[in-house]
């Protein structure tokens, strides 16, 4: 009964002044929630930014993130003999990425079809919960990994079993914390029907009164507690690590280790600059503007920032590459379409010669791991 011709295809929690609230009266009658979607909001929801740019980025993230994190998780769980804290944190990082990325086909379809969500309320809530959950999980596990990397340099000797148990405990605590802090995202109604556009949005238009006040408070709390504080810890760890590496003796092995450490630091810095800082900053600014002015002037930037935050699922594999010898081997061989066993057989003589000449204390193969730089 309707034709929607999309000739020049043109929100998250769109821009609207909230005109009323959803509440249950004393008699148990639900009063309809009122939200505001205006011409600008409508043009964003039908525009190329949301219907072309977002699905392209999400497709790239899915195509790169799914196999790379899938392989990483497989390597860390089944191909790494010694489960060091770094391996545990990276396995959790890969799991967080996978839990987010597996839903991307629905997200891509949603945006391609003009921001029209046809998969039901529950799936929308899961998608959004996992979307934000992944970002905050990544920040926290990256912090743990960074602190652990520094700790290994400062204190290379330590009880592996005890360290591994601590890492498992910390990881479980992080998952529990993220589950708790994302509860509001699962509880809030995320799907809204927009009559003028004949679409049902998922998270792009939020109806609740909490959009104005509570959403600002919520994302401000997350930005401080789950972004700024971990970011400070990560930065501190790397600054101290650079100092330690500068002052250390410079043999061939140390030089290789230092170069890989610098690559890791650059990768993590890039992740913060591209993924975490813009999204957390704009989440707060966006909701602050809605709260104070009734609309957000940074909506397009906010959309782009949240979209770019998903790139952490593509950048994380580079972290695994610089930290884990096992992942490096499997990644190289996967790209060259060779089996690890064949390569290892070919390199047996070379490896034995190298090991006889060099100290193995910094090797990070699955057999002799002390530190994995």
């Amino acid at each position: 009964t309707i034709q929607g011709t999309n000739r020049s295809s043109k929100g998250r929690s769109l821009i609207g002044k909230v005109d009323g609230t959803s509440h249950v009266t004393g008699k148990g009658v639900t009063v309809e929630t009122v939200f505001s979607v205006d011409e600008f909001s409508a043009s964003v929801l039908t525009g190329k930014l949301t219907t072309v740019f977002l699905p392209i980025v999400y497709t790239i993230v899915f195509v790169v993130g799914l196999p790379s994190n899938g392989m990483a998780l497989w390597v860390f769980l089944f191909r790494t003999k010694k489960k060091h804290p770094a391996v545990i944190y990276m396995a959790n990082l890969a799991l967080a990425d996978l839990l987010s990325v597996i839903w991307f086909p629905l997200k891509i379809a949603y945006h391609i079809h003009g921001n029209n969500w046809i998969y039901g309320e529950a799936l929308c809530n899961v998608l959004i919960g996992f979307f934000y959950g992944n970002m905050y999980c990544s920040i926290l596990f990256m912090t743990c990994l960074s602190v652990q990397r520094y700790w290994v340099i400062v204190n290379p000797m330590g009880h592996s079993r005890k360290k591994a148990n601590i890492a498992i405990g910390i990881s479980l605590a992080i998952w529990l914390l993220i589950l708790l802090v994302t509860i509001p995202l699962y509880v809030v109604k995320q799907t809204i029907f927009i009559p003028a556009l004949n679409i049902t949005t998922c998270h792009d238009v939020l109806p609740e009164q909490l959009l104005v006040g509570d959403m600002f408070n919520y994302f401000l709390s997350l930005a401080i507690g789950v972004f700024l504080f971990p970011a400070f810890l990560t930065a501190s760890a790397y600054v101290l690590m650079i100092r330690m590496l500068r002052s250390s003796a410079m043999d061939e092995n140390s030089e290789k280790k230092r170069k890989r450490a610098i690559k890791l630091i650059v990768t993590v810095l890039a992740m913060y600059l591209i993924c975490f800082t813009p999204s957390n900053l704009l989440l707060v600014v966006h909701y602050f503007l809605i709260k104070s002015q009734g609309q957000s002037h940074v909506y397009a930037l906010y959309i782009v920032a949240l979209c770019l935050s998903t790139l952490n699922s593509c950048i994380d594999p580079f972290v695994y590459y610089f930290v884990s010898h096992d992942f490096r081997d499997h990644a190289k061989n996967a790209l060259l379409c060779r089996s690890v066993r064949t390569v290892k057989q070919m390199q047996v003589s070379l490896t034995s010669k190298k090991h006889s000449r060099k100290s193995s204390s910094y090797s990070s193969s699955s057999t002799t791991v002390k530190t994995s730089y």
């Epitope: 009964t1 309707i2 034709q3 929607g4 011709t5 999309n6 000739r7 020049s8 295809s9 043109k10 005109d19 309809e32 009122v34 939200f35 505001s36 979607v37 205006d38 011409e39 909001s41 409508a42 043009s43 039908t46 525009g47 809204i192 029907f193 927009i194 009559p195 003028a196 556009l197 004949n198 238009v205």
Partner: antibody
């Protein structure tokens, strides 16, 4: 002051085509959705077509889908309705409206004076 | 398509009287309802949108109410300039549809 002036109406034979124009003034044309609504003589109102402010999307009821095309020219602040394969039941006064998107729906806030289209042999 | 049924078809009211026009939708329209007034030989004019929000410049004697499928327009203190045909229109699902109209005249 918002002004919408329709033109292009007249007598036309069944099966022929006609193009209606609506010149807008007194507001920023690019900021608003626009709509065509018709009213057959002595009858009620019928929605005919809507177009988004960017012109990127158009919406039609089944009764005119495939025959009518709504378009807009931002430079001229003009809305158009190209009517092909006209039928006698298309005889009506055609109104051009400037819409507001409020709470996610389209509301026909300003109306032109209308232009009469008569389809008869 | 959503069918909009108006009642009564026509009514007369005295000066200062309060009148009410009903509009019934064939399915729930979540308050996405507008009311228009059309005076003889003139274009329609938006009075009420979103069931109860008064359009700018419209006298406060006009008010809208309702929910679900049933909506009404109330004109308190009937004035001579209120004569005309009143239409309801749903803006919930395409195609947008109008009621058949209610003719209001002064007694």
């Amino acid at each position: 002051e918002v002004q919408l002036v329709e033109s292009g109406g007249g007598l036309v034979q069944p099966g022929r085509s006609l193009k209606l124009s609506c010149v807008a003034s007194g507001f920023t044309f690019n900021n608003y959705w626009m709509t065509w609504i018709r009213q057959a003589p002595g009858k009620g109102l019928e929605w005919v077509a809507s177009i988004t402010n960017s012109g990127g999307r158009t919406y039609y009821p089944d009764s005119v889908k495939g025959r009518f095309t709504v378009s807009r020219d931002s430079a001229k602040s003009t809305l158009y309705l190209q009517m092909n394969s006209l039928r006698s039941e298309d005889t009506a006064t055609y109104y051009c409206t400037r819409d507001r998107i409020i709470r996610g729906s389209t509301w026909f806030t300003y109306w032109g004076q209308g232009t009469l289209v008569t389809v008869s042999s | 398509d959503i069918q909009m049924t108006q009642s009564p078809h026509s009514l007369s009211a005295s000066l200062g009287e309060t009148v009410s026009i009903e509009c019934l939708a064939s399915e729930g329209i979540s308050n996405y309802l507008a009311w228009f007034q059309q005076k003889p030989g003139k274009s329609p004019q938006l009075l009420i949108y979103y069931a109860s929000s008064l359009q700018d410049g419209v006298p406060s004697r006009f008010s809208g109410s309702g929910s679900g499928t049933q909506y009404s327009l109330k004109i308190s203190n009937m004035q001579p300039e209120d004569e005309g045909v009143y239409y309801c229109q749903q803006g919930y699902k395409y195609p947008w549809t109008f009621g058949g109209g209610t003719e209001l005249e002064l007694k």
